[in-house]
Amino acid sequence: RAPYWTNTEKMEKRLHAVPAANTVKFRCPAGGNPMPTMRWLKNGKEFKQEHRIGGYKVRNQHWSLIMESVVPSDKGNYTCVVENEYGSINHTYHLDVVERSPHRPILQAGLPANASTVVGGDVEFVCKVYSDAQPHIQWIKHVEKNGSKYGPDGLPYLKVLKHSGINSSNAEVLALFNVTEADAGEYICKVSNYIGQANQSAWLTVLPKQQAPGREKEITASPDYLEHHHHHH
């Protein structure tokens, strides 16, 4: 059987903007019979160990390419080629290496994600943050007062639900339990550091109890290089 992808979800994120000195992992999980082989190209040419200081690791059992401590010269297109005697498939990732210099926080695109749940259900919003400088996270909800979303001054009515704290373990997650219709609305993840701020929002839809929620659920996956953001100072 010709090669085929076994987990396309892990391959959806094609553009990886990674801070210098971080580790990058690209994966191309595949199957086939006989079991296909995998090789990697950089910018369309064979990617050799000597092409980068420190080389790279290939974990064939995980169908992955790992580059540690990336530098600007690692920028480019990385293509996995998976082949056996019955065919060949390929997938390309683009790597951009961001120089480490103080910058305002960067929030992972698409997070927090819109979510829906039924009355009485639980839901989680996740906000993935990259910040060299100590980030400060706030979760804020748009609310109504006397039926209006805006005050006499034209400013929105906002409720601050949660602050992060210097070493908070859970500030990137907003968990809502036993939700009611009143919990529906827009939720903002606002992150700031001493340089600037960024915010992204998501909507919570609360459905009547008899109506099951759709597939619109919060995303919790995060790229490898975001995993240890609280240690970047």
Epitope: H136, P156, V160, K162, H163, S168, A175, L176, F177, D183
Partner: antibody, heavy 121, light 111 residues
Framework: QVTLKESGPGILQSSQTLSLTCSFS??????????VSWIRQPSGKGLEWLAH???????RYNSSLKSRLTISKDTSRNQVFLKITSVDTADTATYYC?????????????WGQGTSVTVSS | DIVLTQSPASLAVSLGQRATISCRAS??????????MHWYQQKPGQPPKLLIY???NLESGIPARFSGSGSRADFTLTINPVETDDVATYYC?????????FGAGTNLELK
């Protein structure tokens, strides 16, 4: 109507662990957006925020005291607890618990009457 | 941590006159156009009571002679006219950044 009431040992010795309880009514700490803080005030001095616990059991601490503080809750019994280890005479104060406002997690809209704690050397 | 500097430390005002208390933050505490500054009143032997939230909003049940103003890092609590019942210590507090911090307090007494 929202009420909070603190209770504690009154007097304890240096190096012991201080255990405080905040019993409340008029709201549920399982409601999204709800939170309770502990604040203390040495006699004749200002207010110092100590810790906060959110509806989802997320916790925040005053960084200068973090290693000595533990906040927890029993949602079903409408209680919040604060433990302070290795107390010293500097921990002598009135300890308050306060519920967050409807607008901000760190705005204290409802306060208990406070419980007086004396640490003797 | 954000430091709040209150002034004056104590204030003596005649009955019926205006009392003005200032609070300056070590950095801006504004976000989304909202000033996260709050004012509390504390009488001896009592817990603090929230008077003003978000710089200028009067808490429910608080008399209209109390008002708050300011933005970014400079804030003012005004009591006009001062009544006997207003003798107390007044604290400002910010909730924009973790940890929440209080000013050292202003003691209001009658002249």
């Amino acid at each position: 109507q929202v009420t909070l009431k603190e209770s504690g040992p009154g007097i304890l010795q240096s190096s012991q662990t201080l255990s405080l309880t905040c019993s409340f009514s008029g709201f549920s700490l399982s409601t999204s957006g709800m939170g309770v803080s502990w604040i203390r005030q040495p006699s004749g001095k200002g207010l110092e925020w100590l810790a906060h616990i959110y509806w989802d059991d997320d916790k925040r601490y005053n960084s200068s005291l973090k290693s000595r503080l533990t906040i927890s809750k029993d949602t079903s019994r409408n209680q919040v607890f604060l433990k302070i280890t290795s107390v010293d005479t500097a921990d002598t104060a009135t300890y308050y618990c306060a519920r967050s406002s409807d607008w901000d997690d760190y705005t204290m809209a409802y306060w208990g009457q406070g419980t007086s704690v004396t640490v003797s050397s | 941590d954000i430091v709040l500097t209150q002034s004056p430390a104590s204030l003596a005002v005649s009955l019926g006159q205006r009392a003005t208390i200032s609070c300056r933050a070590s950095e801006s505490i504004d976000d989304f156009g909202i000033s996260f500054m709050h004012w509390y009143q504390q009488k001896p032997g009592q817990p603090p009571k929230l008077l003003i939230y978000r710089a200028s909003n009067l808490e429910s049940g608080i008399p209209a002679r109390f008002s708050g103003s300011g933005s970014r890092a400079d804030f003012t609590l005004t009591i006009n006219p001062v009544e006997t019942d207003d003798v107390a210590t007044y604290y400002c507090q910010q909730s924009n950044k973790d940890p929440p911090t209080f000013g050292a307090g202003t003691n209001l007494e009658l002249k």
